[in-house]
């Protein structure tokens, strides 16, 4: 079953290469178990950047060497990627699964564009 | 590094499934994200896929996302490519690449310091 999921249009990553954004859903009923993928679409290519699945009201458990770090707060998870470059610009979509009790819902956001600038190296001094 | 042996290609048709495998050995294979590549002829060699080092998260070039997946068995070594739906154009030689680095956002562009030997997958209309 389809499920409603919203995201900023747009975030700016901070100098050190941090980006946040909220991903909210619309929950159809009371979820227990919640998976949670950030997915990259640039390039041509999809990748599925980071995973967490959670149980509503504890914290979140990334998946394998995960570059996310995240909170749930109700039907939003609030998201960061670290060590973001230039070169990670790209659109970051954030997928919704219920996945306990049934039945199964499934959500995509729109995505999020995330813009990273490399910060300017400092000048040397003499 | 690790080495790396392909197997697993062959003649399709248009339409049809083949499941490529990569085997390892030498180094430690969970330390690994694993790579699927591939080339034409006369094409450069481009990113097919890539799979984590547990396991748990992919990566796909858009022309194959929905008909091919990979895996991996890190008990047995194994790096798997299941390709679905095959089109005259997936028609290339096919290699596996390890990758000694943690996940990230561009896997595409990971440092694969092995390569296997290729495997050829030639799909006939």
């Known amino acids: 079953k389809a499920m409603h999921v919203a995201q900023p249009a747009v975030v700016l990553a901070s100098s050190r290469g941090i980006a946040s954004f909220v991903c909210e859903y619309a929950s159809p009923g009371k979820a227990t178990e919640v998976r949670v993928t950030v997915l990259r679409q640039a390039d041509s290519q999809v990748t599925e950047v980071c995973a967490a699945t959670y149980m509503m009201g504890n914290e979140l458990t990334f998946l394998d060497d995960s570059i996310c770090t995240g909170t749930s707060s109700g039907n939003q998870v609030n998201l960061t990627i670290q060590g973001l470059r230039a070169m990670d610009t790209g659109l970051y979509i954030c997928k919704v699964e219920l996945m306990y009790p049934p039945p199964y819902y499934l959500g995509i956001g729109n995505g999020t564009q995330i813009y990273v600038i490399d910060p300017e190296p400092c000048p040397d001094s003499d | 590094e690790v080495q790396l042996v392909e197997s697993g290609g062959g003649l399709v048709q248009t339409g049809g499934s083949l499941r490529l495998s990569c085997a390892a050995s030498?180094?430690?294979?969970?330390?690994?994200?694993m790579g699927w590549f591939r080339q034409a002829p006369g094409k450069d060699r481009e990113f097919v896929a890539a799979?984590?080092?547990?396991?748990?998260?992919?990566a796909y070039a858009d022309s194959v996302k929905g008909r091919f997946t990979p895996s991996r068995d890190n008990a047995k070594k194994m790096a798997y490519l299941q390709m679905n739906s095959l089109k005259p154009e997936d028609t290339a030689v096919y290699y596996c690449a390890a990758a000694p680095v943690p996940w990230g956002t561009r896997p595409s562009l990971f440092p694969y310091d092995s390569w296997g030997q290729g495997t050829q997958v030639t799909v006939s209309s």
């Open positions: 030498g180094r430690t294979f969970s330390n690994y994200t």
């Open positions: 799979i984590s080092r547990s396991g748990s998260l992919k």
